[in-house]
Interface confidence: medium
């Protein structure tokens, strides 16, 4: 069974996947299909880097372009540096412009 078939088999379990498990899978030669990726919790996807999403999706990463206006892809794009998004070569727009300071508001809230 290949990586894609795994995700067809287990996509019903993935809705509650925590970020840590998604990061682990990104290191383990898996190709998640876009339909499954779109079902993930937005708060679990947001902390993933461009490189991690690229490795998690494998050849399916090209499908991000078709989903760039939909959650969780839209919200994830807004959290990435535009430079990093450009490395995918998909024409994704809406990332943080070069030179802008990125504030981790979740950390700020935790400290206040």
């Amino acid at each position: 069974m290949n990586g894609s078939e795994y995700f067809v088999k287990i996509q019903s379990f993935l809705g509650g996947a925590p970020t840590e498990d998604l990061k682990a899978l990104s290191q383990q030669n898996v190709s998640m299909d876009l339909a499954t990726f779109m079902k993930l919790r937005t708060d679990a996807v947001l902390p993933l880097t461009v490189a991690e999403v690229q490795k998690l999706l494998g050849p399916h990463v090209e499908g991000l372009k078709a989903e760039e206006r939909h959650r969780p892809v839209r919200d994830w794009i807004l959290r990435q540096r535009q430079d990093d998004l450009d490395t995918l070569g998909l024409g994704l727009q809406g990332g943080i412009p070069n030179g802008y300071l990125v504030l981790d508001l979740s950390m700020q809230e935790a400290l206040s």
Partner: antibody, heavy 116, light 111 residues
Amino acid sequence: EVKFEESGGGLVQPGGSMKLSCVASGFTFSNYWMNWVRQSPEKGLEWVAQIRLKSDNYATHYAESVKGRFSISRDDSKSSVYLQMNNLRAEDTGIYYCSVGTGGYWGQGTTLTVSS
Amino acid sequence: DIVLTQSPASLALSPGKRATISCRASESVSIIGTDVIHWFQQKPGQPPKLLIYHASNLETGVPARFSGSGSRTDFTLTIDPVEEDDVAIYYCLQSRKIPWTFGGGTKLEIK
């Protein structure tokens, strides 16, 4: 082609220190977790340490047997991972391998001997 | 820690026969449905070489004589048919939880 060049092994006395280095090529080093694994006739293959990515603040994890004595680090600009080993014991003797991700690629290994 | 118990410790087979190696985990090694058990082959003087990842996926370049099966806690590496070149020690690895752990190894000899 993925390649690793490990160095730093040798003979050291109990209580001594040693630093191992592993220089990688052939893949985007900064995107992958890196591990050190060791092998001895007594213990077989034993995972030693792991370092994650810059986006994870270079989080590190260690086997219980080396916690507080070993320190893993990486330099993404040099595609290198290191293992600083202090207060070495006889049971640390073995072949030390660096490996990428979940073991898709391994170095040839460098031998550490801890003996008086 | 997750303990991986491999059996048998060694086996000797004639060329053309089927080799079956078991790896049993002390708890589930599934990450949201993906079984993160990997099989390695190690020949004398060489580092381990990845054969199978995620319990059943054949690594690129590995002959189709090698296959993996199982889920959750019970996994099997099968070599069918065995060839002279398969003389080695075979290990399983779990990457589900820190510390990552290896099985004790199975030595395959050819009669």
